[in-house]
């Protein structure tokens, strides 16, 4: 008789998720020297016990402790871009400016980056089938707590001008409400961050409004002056030009305003 | 206890200059941002910018843009307003004030504020 | 910027009444409402922050509720010590800005 299940909101866990994620972090430690020392059967190990057996809509950060720790890496804190609903573009970037990195250019976030995990109460089984959703289910399930929990620690980590790039053609372009506004913005420490840079990433080509001047920006240098930090904004017209200009700075194009 | 303990009142003429002071006691004066308020007689608070109490850095609302200026003395944990070419309209008290934050909750409050500094500008 | 408009702007209230001061915003400013009691000749003292969050030491009777753009204030059973202005301030973005105050007297 097949067990009763939970029947969750949300898509169930990746297919093959132990694979993939003991697959990435080999991958990543053979191409990271200074993450070399890590032993990925132990990361696993680690991951694993933070939601397996656990009923996903109780997990706590405490939970992936055993994961921070087997994790920890030092990124240089003022080389640190975060991003709002606009992750491909902040990939693509630092993937040509090789010094800055977002929270998914290190181990932690390279890891668990698109992936979708959960496991059942009492039962060392991962659940393919359904996870909760984060609205429609519980905000305690095991993929929002660790990107809580990581996104968290990269924010405290971060330090001088810290980098964040937001999506101009959304009609929240900073949202109080995603991992950015609710977490990494209340996270980042005055003692250490001078300013916070936003970039605003324009989407139509004919489209040259000031989006800095934008209400929902206004909240944004709200809550981080704040916390006495200094607030800057810069519209990127031209996200397709910034990223050629960021690979060839010397182009005579990228003098002017992109 | 936390303290900000504002200078005295000031008695000015049209077209001089006026510096008030804020010092700060009981916390560490560069974790928060000291925001400056001003009160005319009968009239609402208004806001007037924020100082980055680490870097000096000041932040003016629109309306005091030109001949104000906050500075700080951070060996002294003290921030001052500085009001340039005194008109009759700055005649009012001056508040400064700090923004807390909660590091554990992501609270927010204006919560302390200076006795306030009278500014009486008259020929 | 946001405006903030508050009423009524003047109150005269008997002891031991309930009071209730209103503020709206012209924009969605979440819960980011601060209320302030002034007393005659001192600072603006905070009673509630954002969120509707009671400041610490502050008595229970007085509460906050609201969200978006309607706001409202309420504090029960009126005392001679609670005679003073009191204003609304959002802090949602900047620059903030207050209300037009309420002034609280005894009938």
């Known amino acids: 008789v097949p067990r009763w299940r939970q029947q969750w909101s949300g898509p169930g866990t990746t297919k093959r998720f132990p694979e993939t994620v003991l697959a990435r972090c080999v991958k990543y430690t053979e191409i990271h020297p200074e993450m070399r020392h890590v032993d990925c059967q132990s990361v696993w190990d680690a991951f694993k016990g933070a939601f397996i057996s656990k009923h996903p809509c109780n997990i706590t950060e405490e939970d992936y402790q055993p994961l921070m720790k087997l994790g920890t890496q030092t990124v240089p804190c003022n080389k640190i871009l975060l991003w709002s609903r606009i992750k491909d573009l902040a990939h693509q970037f630092t993937q040509v400016q090789r010094d800055m990195f977002t929270l998914e250019d290190t181990l932690l976030g390279y890891l668990a980056d698109d992936l979708t995990w959960c496991g059942e109460f009492n039962t060392s089984k991962i659940n393919y089938q359904s996870c909760p959703d984060w609205r429609k289910d519980c905000s305690n399930n095991p993929v929002s707590v660790f990107w809580k929990t990581v996104s968290r620690r990269f924010a405290e980590a971060a330090c001088d001008v810290v980098h964040v790039m937001l999506n101009g053609s959304r009609s929240k372009i900073f949202d109080k409400n995603s991992t950015f506004g609710s977490v990494e913005v209340h996270n980042l420490q005055p003692e250490k961050v001078q300013t916070l840079e936003a970039w605003v990433i324009h989407g139509g080509r004919e489209d040259s409004r000031d989006l800095c001047q934008d209400p929902t920006i206004k909240e944004l240098e709200s809550i981080i002056s704040k916390r006495n930090i200094q607030f800057s904004c810069k519209n990127i017209y031209r996200p397709d030009k910034f990223l050629q200009c960021v690979k060839n700075p010397e182009d005579s194009s990228c003098t002017s305003e992109i | 206890q936390i303290q900000l303990v504002q200078s005295g009142p000031e008695l000015k003429k049209p077209g001089e200059t006026v510096k008030i002071s804020c010092k700060a006691s009981?916390?560490?004066?560069?974790?928060?941002?000291m925001n400056w308020v001003k009160q005319a007689p009968g009239e609402d608070l208004k806001w007037m910018g924020w100082l980055n109490t680490n870097t000096g850095e000041p932040t003016y609302a629109e309306e005091f843009k030109g001949r104000f200026a906050f500075s700080l003395e951070t060996s002294a944990s003290t921030a001052y307003l500085q009001i340039n070419n005194l008109r009759n309209e700055d005649t009012a008290t001056y508040f400064c004030?700090?923004?807390?934050?909660?590091?554990?909750?992501?609270?927010?409050?204006?919560?302390?504020w200076g006795q306030g500094t009278s500014v009486t500008v008259s020929s | 910027e946001t405006i903030v408009t508050q009423f009524p702007a003047s109150l005269s209230m008997a002891i031991g009444e309930k009071v209730t001061i209103r503020c709206i915003t012209s924009t969605d400013i979440d819960d980011d409402m601060n209320w302030y009691q002034q007393r005659p000749g001192e600072p603006p003292k905070l009673l509630i922050s954002e969120g509707n969050t009671l400041r610490p030491g502050v008595p229970s009777r007085f509460s906050s509720s609201g969200y978006g753009t309607d706001f409202v204030f309420t504090f029960e059973n009126m005392l001679s010590e609670d005679v003073a202005d009191y204003y609304c301030?959002?802090?949602?973005?900047?620059?903030?800005?207050v209300g037009g105050g309420t002034r609280l007297e005894i009938k």
């Open positions: 009981g916390y560490t004066f560069t974790n928060y941002g």
């Open positions: 004030a700090r923004w807390y934050y909660g590091s554990s909750d992501n609270s927010y409050a204006m919560d302390y």
């Open positions: 301030l959002q802090s949602d973005s900047l620059p903030y800005t």
